[in-house]
C-alpha cells in the first residue's frame, strides 16, 4: 500500500492547525508540564510489519480524535480550528484504513499488534487522567496540546519510514 502524498501533507497541516490552537502563553504553564510516557518504541517501526505499523498510527490518530472531541475540548479551543483539525484527522484515518485493507493477505503476520494498540491506549488514558486531575484547566490543555504535537511529529517519522519501505 502506498500512503498517498496527501497523507503526509495532511499530517503537516494537522501540526500547523495545532500550532495555531494555542490560547495562552505556554510559558505561564511551565509548572504544569508532565511526562506522559510517550511510547516511543511503538513508533520506531523497526519491529513492525507494515500493516502493524499502520494500525498503531491509526490508533494514535483515533485516540487524538477522541480526546479533542469531548465537550471539555470544545469549550477550550476555537471552533473553526477544531473543525479543520477534525477534517484533517478524518482524512488521515481514511487513508490509513484504505491502506490496511490493501495489506489484507499481503503479509503473513497479523494486521494488528494488540500489545502495541493497548500501549497507545494507555498513553492516552494517562493524558485523560492528567486533564481530569487538573480539572481541564487552560494550562492542562496547553500542556496536552504540546504533547500531542510532539507525538504527531514522532509519528510522522514512522510514516516517512513506511513510505521509504514501499
Amino acid at each position: 500500500c502506498d500512503l498517498p502524498q496527501t497523507h503526509s501533507l495532511s499530517n503537516r497541516r494537522t501540526l500547523m492547525i495545532m500550532a495555531q490552537m494555542g490560547r495562552i502563553s505556554p510559558f505561564s504553564c511551565l509548572k504544569d508540564r508532565h511526562d506522559f510516557g510517550f511510547p516511543q518504541e511503538e513508533f520506531d517501526g523497526n519491529q513492525f510489519q507494515k500493516a502493524q505499523a499502520i494500525s498503531v498510527l491509526h490508533e494514535m490518530i483515533q485516540q487524538t480524535f477522541n480526546l479533542f472531541s469531548t465537550k471539555d475540548s470544545s469549550a477550550t479551543w476555537d471552533e473553526t480550528l477544531l473543525d479543520k483539525f477534525y477534517t484533517e484527522l478524518y482524512q488521515q484515518l481514511n487513508d490509513l484504513e484504505a491502506c490496511m485493507m490493501q495489506e489484507v493477505g499481503v503479509e503473513d503476520t497479523p494486521l494488528m499488534n494488540v500489545d502495541s494498540i493497548l500501549t497507545v491506549r494507555k498513553y492516552f488514558q494517562r493524558i485523560t487522567l492528567y486533564l481530569t486531575e487538573k480539572k481541564y484547566s487552560p494550562c492542562a490543555w496547553e500542556v496536552v496540546r504540546a504533547e500531542i504535537m510532539r507525538s504527531f511529529s514522532l509519528s510522522a517519522n514512522l510514516q516517512e519510514r513506511l513510505r521509504r519501505k514501499e
Epitope: M16, R33, D35
Partner: antibody, heavy 120, light 111 residues
Framework: QVQLQESGTVLARPGASVKMSCKAS????????MHWVKQRPGQGLEWIGV????????TYNQKFKDKAKLTAVTSANTAYMELSSLTNEDSAVYFC?????????????WGQGTTVTVSS | DIVLTQSPASLAVSLGQRATISCRAS??????????MHWYQQKPGQTPKLLIY???NLESGVPARFSGSGSGTDFTLNIHPVEEEDAATYYC?????????FGSGTKLEIK
C-alpha cells in the same frame, strides 16, 4: 534544510539603537518559537527572550525587557531584535535559535550570530 | 533566577579517557518525570550545538560516547571515550522556569 541567516556585524555609538535580523528557511517559520541568546566575548550564554512568529507572542528575561524588543514578519520569514540605549555591556554576539521539542524549550538550530560592537 | 554552577571550569583529558562535567542548579529543574536540563557543545568560532536534552536524551546525530544523567539539582555530562574533535566548551541550560539560564561553561582540552 533548516537555516537561520543573521545580519552582519554592527558598529554603534553608546546610547544608539540597533536592529538585527534572522531570516529562517527550510521549515514552517510561523509554528516554531524563536529564542535570542547573547554571548559576550570569551563569556557564557544568556537567554534574552523568545517570540512566536505565528502571533507575535513574546516572553522576555526580565533582565532584558527594557533592552530588547523582539518582532517577526511572517511574510519575510524573518525575526528581528532591536536593542536600545546601547552601552559597552551590549557589545556581544547575538544568536537567534529555533525552539525544539515544543515545551522542552531546547534549541536545535542556531544562526551564525550578529556581532554588535558599541564604541564611541 | 536559577543559577547553574558548572564544574570544573576547565579540564584536560587524555585521548580515549573519560571526561565528566558537572552542572548544579540552585533549585530543582525536575517536575513530573522530566528533568529540564540540556547540554550544548561550542567549538571555537562556531555556534553551540545541542547534545543532550531532558538530562539524558541523546540528540539525533550525536555520537553515543556522549551521555547525560541526573535529576533535581545535580546533573552530569559524560564523554567516553574522548576524541580529538571533542575539544570545546560545554554548557548546561535549564528550562525549568523563567528565565532560562545557562551554566558558565566548561572548557575541555584533549591531551
Amino acid at each position: 534544510q533548516v537555516q537561520l541567516q543573521e545580519s552582519g556585524t554592527v558598529l554603534a555609538r553608546p546610547g544608539a539603537s540597533v536592529k538585527m535580523s534572522c531570516k529562517a528557511s527550510g521549515y514552517s517559520f510561523t509554528t516554531y518559537w524563536m529564542h535570542w541568546v547573547k554571548q559576550r566575548p570569551g563569556q557564557g550564554l544568556e537567554w534574552i527572550g523568545v517570540i512566536y512568529p505565528g502571533n507575535g507572542d513574546t516572553t522576555y528575561n526580565q533582565k532584558f525587557k527594557d533592552k530588547a524588543k523582539l518582532t517577526a514578519v511572517t511574510s519575510a520569514n524573518t525575526a528581528y531584535m532591536e536593542l536600545s540605549s546601547l552601552t559597552n555591556e551590549d557589545s556581544a554576539v547575538y544568536f537567534c535559535t529555533r525552539n525544539y521539542k515544543y515545551d522542552y524549550y531546547t534549541m536545535d538550530y542556531w544562526g551564525q550570530g550578529t556581532t554588535v560592537t558599541v564604541s564611541s | 533566577d536559577i543559577v547553574l554552577t558548572q564544574s570544573p571550569a576547565s579540564l584536560a583529558v587524555s585521548l580515549g579517557q573519560r571526561a565528566t562535567i558537572s552542572c548544579r542548579a540552585s533549585k530543582s529543574v525536575s517536575t513530573s518525570g522530566h528533568s529540564y536540563m540540556h547540554w550544548y557543545q561550542q567549538k571555537p568560532g562556531q555556534t553551540p550545538k545541542l547534545l543532550i536534552y531532558l538530562a539524558s536524551n541523546l540528540e539525533s546525530g550525536v555520537p553515543a560516547r556522549f551521555s547525560g544523567s541526573g535529576s533535581g539539582t545535580d546533573f552530569t555530562l559524560n564523554i567516553h571515550p574522548v576524541e580529538e574533535e571533542d575539544a570545546a566548551t560545554y554548557y548546561c541550560q535549564h528550562s525549568g522556569e523563567l528565565p532560562f539560564t545557562f551554566g558558565s561553561g566548561t572548557k575541555l582540552e584533549i591531551k
